[in-house]
């Protein structure tokens, strides 16, 4: 018995059958297959698979494999069967199935397709027309993410200089793994003349908060107290602030990084929801001081992509000295 079992482990199994590929949503590619015909009866089947470039090797008992990938180029999966989870075991002959991107002139596809998730409330995507495109092309953007039942078409197409774009509502769902997923994007034209372009936007990457809103500036001795309203939708551990103070007399430009801070000093309007406060030390009250603030996401919540919010509106306090 033991010998037979040992033989079935070293003996190469027949190849898998009926390997097929399909696309779900916009960018979810799914391969399915059937077990090999004539596999050893005492073999517990496992399937070895990897993509064409030998990436993402996987050994699993399931007869399917999926990947979320922008379908801008051909992608192939090779699958074989074996009797153990051992990667060194030689699998059966590998069967390959590929899927190609939609037809079309590659020069007609839009370029620089990118999206930013603004304040966790709406996503704004933009792109440049392809080189072989007529100037009057009417673009359509389609999007899908896990909380949508079907693919949606973006309605708000706009033009900004050379760029085209579209924005759609995308609100963070509280208490869920919403942000661990991605938004799938496709841009094509209404007439079907251009090659569609795809993108996958992880919801942990390109996040741009709204600018803070300065509510109050006040002096206490030689300290400047700044109070502002935080952008909505974010939890406190995910944001930090850059407070910039410019002094007209000394022409100094001081920058402070600030953690979201409670308004506990008597100088501040206290217990106002969603506000933060900061004390700038050693500021001259008899000179004009101009403050502005911007905010950035923390890399432990959202991937580092250097996206600060826009600056808040400036607010000034103090008086400008006459240059006599």
């Amino acid at each position: 018995d033991y010998k037979d079992d040992d033989e079935s482990r070293t003996e190469t199994q027949p190849p898998v059958t009926n390997l097929s590929v399909s696309v779900e949503n916009l960018c979810t590619v799914i391969w399915t297959w059937n077990p090999p015909e004539g596999a050893s009866s005492n073999c517990s089947l496992w399937y070895f698979s990897h993509f064409g470039d030998k990436q993402d090797k996987k050994i699993a008992p399931e007869t399917r494999r999926s990947i979320e990938v922008p379908l801008n180029e051909r992608i192939c999966l090779q699958v074989g069967s074996q009797c153990s989870t051992n990667e060194s075991e030689k699998p059966s002959i590998l069967v390959e199935k590929c899927i190609s991107p939609p037809e079309g002139d590659p020069e007609s596809a839009v370029t620089e397709l990118q999206c930013i998730w603004h304040n966790l409330s709406y996503m704004k995507c933009s792109w440049l027309p392809g080189r072989n495109t007529s100037p009057d092309t009417n673009y359509t953007l389609y999007y899908w993410h896990r909380s949508l039942e079907k693919i949606h078409q973006c309605e708000n197409i706009f033009r900004e200089g050379q760029y085209f774009g579209c924005s759609f509502d995308l609100t963070k769902v509280k208490d869920s793994s919403f942000e661990q997923h991605s938004v799938q994007i496709m841009v094509k034209d209404n007439a079907g003349k251009i090659k569609p372009s795809f993108n996958i936007v992880p919801l942990t990457s390109r996040v741009k908060p709204d600018p803070p809103h300065i509510k109050n500036l006040s002096f206490h001795n030689d300290d400047l107290y700044v109070q502002w309203e935080n952008p909505q939708n974010f939890i406190s551990r995910c944001l930090f602030y850059e407070v910039e103070v410019n002094n007209s007399q000394t022409e100094t430009h001081n920058v402070f990084y600030v953690q979201e801070a409670k308004c506990e000093n008597p100088e501040f309007e206290r217990n106002v929801e969603n506000t933060s406060c900061f004390m700038v030390p050693g500021v001259l009250p008899d000179t004009l001081n101009t403050v502005r603030i911007r905010v950035k996401t923390n890399k432990l919540c959202y991937e580092d992509d250097k996206l600060w919010s826009n600056w808040s509106q400036e607010m000034s306090i103090g008086k400008k000295r006459n240059s006599t």
Partner: antibody, heavy 118, light 104 residues
Amino acid sequence: EVQLVQSGAEVKKPGESLKISCKGSGYSFTSYWIGWVRQMPGKGLEWMGVIYPGDSYTRYSPSFQGQVTISADKSISTAYLQWSSLKASDTAMYYCVRMPNWGSLDHWGQGTLVTVSS
Amino acid sequence: EIVLTQSPGTLSLSPGERATLSCRASQSISSSYLAWYQQKPGQAPRLLIYGASSRATGIPDRFSGSGSGTDFTLTISRLEPEDFAVYYCQQYETFGQGTKVEIK
């Protein structure tokens, strides 16, 4: 004044469990991350992971995921680092650190020396 | 995963000289996240610079940080006897391997 005070040195045998502590004072404990940094004898600094005591959200460095557990008790402003089964290679100085959201480690505990030897 | 590489490994200088320490990231990082630390034997490290160029509280102005993208620099304009130590750069979960500044 911001202070992070760590528990004392420990000498343990391989396979034993251990929990070391770090008590924060002089600031709002729930508004900053607390992290742990390892320094093996004569070596550099290694970031192990962090916890945000406000909601107990934790993040581990891939090298330490599953090897240690970071926790916090905000009622007593204390963070913990624990091992369920120590190895000789865990012998090191462990520092607790305060981390604001921009990721720098602005205050450090005095360090806890852990020695694991049979 | 981002790798931070510090150079040189050891810098031998005399008091009063200028020290220039380099930290190179394997890919572009936001300067907001880059920090520098000093560690003396038997002591915990201390923060010198955060956000690539902002001095931490109580740090003398002979210490300055600069750089962006993948290349960052810590400069000590005139070395004092107490500045001989090991210096580390850091970005969230990654530290450089350290540069030792020793007396020549």
